[in-house]
């Protein structure tokens, strides 16, 4: 039985040109995390393998950095980065847990007047 839950940063906003950390945390399970995949819509951004480390997609090499921890840092944000991001935890023996984060990238002037979304 899958007992775990994923806590995420939820809905977040960031300024165009800036960077943002996407974070997920798996709790309430003793399952072993074997790999975490980070995805945006239908694109695989990065993989963190528990034994082997990080690999970043060659198409995002310039704008994605691993960490902190199992999180992911997106850099040089553009408005096109707005959308859903998923952290997919592959665990043994539970199986797969998925967390969702919605990122809105705002024009600088909008961001200065306060983000529409708050990190819970």
């Amino acid at each position: 039985m899958m007992t775990g839950t994923i806590e995420t940063t939820g809905n977040i906003s960031a300024e165009k040109g800036g960077s943002i950390i996407l974070q997920c945390h798996l709790s309430s399970t003793t399952a072993q995390v074997t790999q975490v995949n980070w995805e945006q819509q239908d694109q695989l951004l990065a993989i963190c393998n528990a034994d082997l480390g990080w690999h970043i997609s060659p198409s995002f090499k310039d704008r994605v950095a691993p960490g902190p921890g199992l999180g992911l840092t997106l850099q040089s944000l553009t408005v096109n980065d707005t959308g859903e991001y998923f952290c997919i935890y592959h665990t043994y023996p539970d199986g797969t847990y998925t967390g969702r984060i919605f990122l809105e990238v705002l024009e600088s002037s909008v961001a200065e007047h306060g983000a529409r979304f708050q990190i819970p």
Partner: antibody
Framework: EVKLVESGGALVQPGGSLKLSCAAS????????MYWVRQTPEKRLEWVAS????????YYPDTLKGRFTISRDNAKNTLYLQMSRLKSEDTDMYYC????????????WGQGTSVTVSS | DIVMTQSHKFMSTSVGDRVTITCKAS??????VAWYQQKPGQSPKLLIY???ARHTGVPDRFTGSGSGTDFTLTISNVQSEDLADYFC?????????FGVGTKLELK
């Protein structure tokens, strides 16, 4: 069992067009990135194109951009490669391949389909 | 573009021997390197990914190692069915690039 079966290879004249297909079975096609890779008669391997799971993004080497187009139909479990303005140097064996779920690497390849560009 | 150099186009070996195939990247690719085996008339088959991880079903006589720019594929206790072409590939950066291959043949 993962199975990838390419088709559509043919003898075509320089300047002509050709569309290759790759029928996938034995896995959930829409969950995987897919690739086309070609191999010259001298056995040199060259990456041709990549496509994301839903087909929203495609990638090509600069040398092939504009002439080749990768696409997919997830309802039909089929990958395509549209090739235009073909040149003699496009004469190759064309393979489709699946990206691994563990890494950005091609874990299963089809048997290939042969393309010959000659007048 | 990242050039993957396999300096030995041919390597001779005997059944039971240990052989090491090398591959050098023109720039740092971390551990984003795969090794493929291709037998005559067949398509390439993945052996190693992440520089050292064995693909499902690959015998443990195949071992990959290296990081940065220098990579090796070692086959210990070579079997006759291992006689094939071996290609390295980097997937750290686009365009994805392959080595020219090393043909493993009997002495």
């Amino acid at each position: 069992e993962v199975k990838l079966v390419e088709s559509g290879g043919a003898l075509v004249q320089p300047g002509g067009s050709l569309k290759l297909s790759c029928a996938a079975s034995g896995f959930t096609f829409s969950d995987y990135y897919m690739y086309w890779v070609r191999q010259t008669p001298e056995k040199r391997l060259e990456w041709v194109a990549s496509i994301t799971k839903g087909g929203g993004s495609t990638y090509y080497p600069d040398t092939l951009k504009g002439r080749f187009t990768i696409s997919r139909d997830n309802a039909k479990n089929t990958l395509y490669l549209q090739m235009s303005r073909l040149k003699s140097e496009d004469t190759d064996m064309y393979y489709c391949a699946r990206q691994s779920s563990y890494d950005f690497v091609m874990d299963y390849w089809g048997q290939g389909t042969s393309v010959t560009v000659s007048s | 573009d990242i050039v993957m150099t396999q300096s030995h186009k041919f390597m001779s070996t005997s059944v039971g021997d240990r052989v090491t195939i090398t591959c050098k990247a023109s720039q740092d690719v971390d551990t984003a390197v795969a090794w493929y085996q291709q037998k005559p008339g067949q398509s390439p088959k993945l052996l190693i990914y992440w520089a050292s991880a064995r693909h499902t079903g690959v015998p443990d006589r195949f071992t990959g190692s290296g990081s940065g720019t220098d990579f090796t594929l070692t086959i210990s206790n070579v079997q006759s069915e291992d006689l094939a072409d071996y290609f390295c590939q980097q997937y750290s950066n686009y365009p994805l690039t392959f080595g020219v291959g090393t043909k493993l043949e009997l002495k």
